[in-house]
């Protein structure tokens, strides 16, 4: 028995659908199939989950957060043994095992490795203005998503004649800041910032106004 | 001075997608400027579709989120509009457009695409 | 999305008279406004941006006023070549959203 190679890794962006391939080669008939697949949760290392179970000539359900979402792709009992799983969630982030016994047919390898990546898109970032507004100050605009897998990047343009930030503006794209030194009348305006990632993109928007002195009366 | 151009089939099959060209000439896409999909329904409606910013990313409206693509050719300086799953609904002029602040200061002159059977 | 509402939908008026169109938000965009004019089989021309901004090239008679959520163009003396229709937008961010748009014919 001879279970062939897996593509290594899969990325599936949360709630799609994923299919974890698993086939294999023997020399006996179907008839005493065992196959059981096995997830090492990313977030649990410690805490190996059944999957779905296939003996006997019966499915039987794993664990329960898998319920109602996980099947074989095709009839069983047959040489491929790649299951889906629906509406794929951040926890389902792991190491799948599928391990094949199919008596008297021993020997070889039996067991495939497949990693599952579940991807997650910026969710709507939060922007916020630290500092005064007044003239001639110096202003960080802060932007972060709570969630995001993987890690998404911000970046800050101002919603103007060209995208670009003023001149006077440093920003740091991991933390998600701008400074904007010795703001002025001309640093007024929207500011967007972007939080994107390998799956998807998100904004947020702040309206900076700059405070101009009040003239003083002289009396 | 800044020049854009929509190019594509005319004509569109239901659920088939929609593929359109914008050439944009006098200016490099990648210098500044976030580069548009608008299209005009035959009541004469305006609806922003998304664009791809100079510096690649892409922003859709939520209301075709799930059927949009949008991308570049840096190389030839053109961008373009991916329309999945299209129906009789799409039937519109379609025009490319540049803009800074979201107004839009540059459009092409726009080419009608007809979904039918 | 912030809903864009303009009025009148059509009106008509003669070669030197002054009208105004005016625009509403659903909800306060600042003066984040542009006005365009399109003319029939052609690609809509940037009138006015931050709601009072004239674009490049357009003649004064135009002008944009408002801010929050009411917003207005007036154009004055009225020359043939305004007859069209015009759209408002917010550019508030995304989705950008356009008005209905007004119809403006020669009496």
């Known amino acids: 028995l001879e279970v062939s190679e897996s593509p290594g890794s899969i990325q599936v962006a949360r709630g799609q659908p994923a299919v974890l391939p698993c086939t294999f080669t023997t020399s006996a008939a179907l008839i005493n199939l065992n196959v059981i697949w096995m997830v090492t949760p990313l977030s649990n290392a410690n805490q190996p989950e059944q999957v779905i179970l296939y003996q006997g000539g019966q499915m039987f359900d794993g664990a329960p957060r898998f319920h109602g979402r996980v099947g074989f792709t095709g009839t069983m009992p047959a040489t491929n043994v790649s299951i889906f799983i629906n509406n794929t969630q951040l926890s389902d982030t792991g190491t799948y095992q599928c391990l094949v016994n199919n008596l008297p047919d021993i020997g070889g390898r039996n067991i495939g490795v497949t990693g599952l990546t579940v991807l997650v898109p910026p969710s709507a970032p939060h922007c916020q203005i630290q500092g005064s507004q007044d003239i001639g100050s110096d202003v960080i605009l802060l932007c972060s998503s709570e969630e995001g897998i993987p890690r998404p990047t911000y970046l800050w343009e101002k919603l103007d004649n060209t995208l670009k930030l003023p001149p006077t503006a440093t920003q740091d794209q991991v933390q998600g800041t701008v400074t904007i030194r010795n703001i002025s009348a001309l640093s007024s305006g929207l500011y967007q910032c972007v939080a994107s990632n390998a799956i998807g993109t998100s904004t947020c928007l702040l309206d900076l106004q700059v405070i101009s002195p009040q003239p003083r009366n002289i009396g | 001075d800044v020049q854009l151009q929509e190019s594509g089939p005319g004509l569109v099959k239901p659920s088939q997608s929609l593929s359109l060209t914008c050439t944009v000439t006098?200016?490099?896409?990648?210098?500044?400027?976030?580069w548009n999909w608008i299209r005009q329904f035959p009541g004469n409606k305006l609806e922003w579709m998304g664009y791809?910013?100079?510096?690649?990313?892409?922003i859709y409206n939520p209301s075709l989120k799930s059927r949009i693509s949008i991308t570049r050719d840096t190389s030839k300086n053109h961008f373009f509009l991916q329309l999945n799953s299209v129906t009789t609904e799409d039937t519109a002029t379609y025009y490319c457009?540049?803009?800074?602040?979201?107004?839009?200061?540059?459009w092409g002159q726009g080419t009608l695409v007809t979904v039918s059977a | 999305d912030i809903q864009m509402t303009q009025s009148p939908a059509s009106l008509s008026a003669s070669v030197g008279e002054t009208v105004t169109i005016t625009c509403r938000a659903s909800?306060?965009?600042?003066?984040?406004l542009a006005w365009y004019q399109q003319k029939q089989g052609k690609s809509p021309q940037l009138l006015v941006y931050?709601?009072?901004t004239l674009a490049e090239g357009v003649p004064s008679r135009f002008s944009g006023s408002g801010s929050g959520t009411q917003f207005s163009l007036k154009i004055n003396s009225l020359q043939p070549e305004d007859f069209g229709s015009y759209y408002c937008?917010?550019?508030?961010?995304?989705?950008?959203?356009f008005g209905g748009g007004t119809k403006l014919e020669i009496k």
């Open positions: 931050n709601a009072k």
């Open positions: 791809i910013s100079y510096s690649g990313y892409a």
């Open positions: 457009a540049r803009s800074g602040g979201s107004w839009f200061a540059y």
């Open positions: 937008q917010h550019h508030y961010g995304t989705p950008p959203t």
């Open positions: 006098g200016y490099s896409i990648t210098s500044d400027y976030a």
């Open positions: 909800e306060n965009i600042n003066s984040y």
